[in-house]
Amino acid sequence: SGTTNTVAAYNLTWKSTNFKTILEWEPKPVNQVYTVQISTKSGDWKSKCFYTTDTECDLTDEIVKDVKQTYLARVFSYPAGNVESTGSAGEPLYENSPEFTPYLETNLGQPTIQSFEQVGTKVNVTVEDERTLVRRNNTFLSLRDVFGKDLIYTLYYWKSSSSGKKTAKTNTNEFLIDVDKGENYCFSVQAVIPSRTVNRKSTDSPVECMGQEKGEFREI
């Protein structure tokens, strides 16, 4: 129960990519405002996004403190202009979010091919090590820093003249593949965390092809 005309939030949903984490909910407020609280399972509640008319709250700063923890959030509903008012039980109306473990659940962002270099019949393809908002010793960590060997990349590569996609995998950010001399190849990469059961794959990087400026060709 709650104050007249105040409705509880619903459809609380975590939206998270490379640890940038936003809690979303419904409904759009009519004569009410929201405040969000977040906590680890064993920790204290911390309030965020005070008395907002938004239906989202950026909780990145909280979850990056320990991405392996499991977090719970709750969204409180208050009557607009009367935020001290509480429900009939003396508590404001609120709804709990699903639990969220960033390390296991954040979506992997679209990777980017940083460069490729051909030397004879070998091509070295390098994937950009994307920066996250996770910090250690006041510096932002890369995706590789956070996930270590849990993160692999799958490279799809194909001759410009054909459609079949060969694959290679690496647990670094570099591939060294064999190619046919005189052929142009295209490349796309996908980040994967095989130890997960859901959200295992990123979307594919933009396709890069030999003969474009990103690559370098050296004849040996």
Epitope: I152, S163, G164, K166, P194, S195, R196, V198, R200
Partner: antibody, heavy 120, light 107 residues
Framework: EVQLVESGGGLVQPGGSLRLSCAAS????????IHWVRQAPGKGLEWVGY????????YYADSVKGRFTISADTSKNTAYLQMNSLRAEDTAVYYC?????????????WGQGTLVTVSS | DIQMTQSPSSLSASVGDRVTITCRAS??????VAWYQQKPGKAPKLLIY???FLYSGVPSRFSGSRSGTDFTLTISSLQPEDFATYYC?????????FGQGTKVEIK
């Protein structure tokens, strides 16, 4: 529990077509890769091709290239093998299999197989 | 394509015997080799991955090793349920390729 169930096998004449289905349960196919592997009677295992259902990327063995097509319906959590211009040498048990997708583990689960016989 | 040459093609052994099957890759495949067991009328089952790692639920009498491009599957003490056909497979490059198989029969 992870399960892969193939169906659609049967007797077909040379030059004919057949579509095999691979219904997956216990996991979401877009999170993995699906392979088709075949085994002619009394022979060894031969890799046919794969699909990444997440992006639709495929690759085929030379022996089936241009004749076979792998696809997936993610809403049904099912992969397919469309076989055209079938030849006697395509007679085999066809297995679909799940690729775990790591550097170390490759195929970790297989279906029970479905028999395709190409004969006049 | 990488060729996986498996030997022997068949062998006869008794319960309790130590059995060794080898596979040679035609070029470097790092440790990207798996071993599968297949019984008549059944699908293959994963035994060993990454050349030497025992897959979950597989008895510890099975082991795998690598020396350069040579890969070995060893059954330390053959059990009645181990009579089957064994295949190696490389997944280092596309297309992945299988060895021809080794049939382990009762002596």
């Amino acid at each position: 529990e992870v399960q892969l169930v193939e169906s659609g096998g049967g007797l077909v004449q040379p030059g004919g077509s057949l579509r095999l289905s691979c219904a997956a349960s216990g996991f979401t196919i877009t999170d993995y890769w699906i392979h088709w592997v075949r085994q002619a009677p009394g022979k060894g295992l031969e890799w046919v091709g794969y699909i990444d259902p997440y992006n639709g990327y495929t690759y085929y063995a030379d022996s089936v290239k241009g004749r076979f097509t792998i696809s997936a319906d993610t809403s049904k959590n099912t992969a397919y093998l469309q076989m055209n211009s079938l030849r006697a040498e395509d007679t085999a048990v066809y297995y679909c299999a799940r690729d775990y997708g790591s550097l170390q583990v490759f195929i970790d689960y297989w279906g029970q197989g479905t028999l395709v016989t190409v004969s006049s | 394509d990488i060729q996986m040459t498996q030997s022997p093609s068949s062998l006869s052994a008794s319960v309790g015997d130590r059995v060794t099957i080898t596979c040679r890759a035609s070029q470097d495949v790092n440790t990207a080799v798996a071993w599968y067991q297949q019984k008549p009328g059944k699908a293959p089952k994963l035994l060993i991955y990454s050349a030497s790692f025992l897959y979950s639920g597989v008895p510890s009498r099975f082991s795998g090793s690598r020396s350069g491009t040579d890969f070995t599957l060893t059954i330390s003490s053959l059990q009645p349920e181990d009579f089957a056909t064994y295949y190696c497979q490389q997944h280092y490059t596309t297309p992945p390729t299988f060895g021809q198989g080794t049939k382990v029969e009762i002596k």
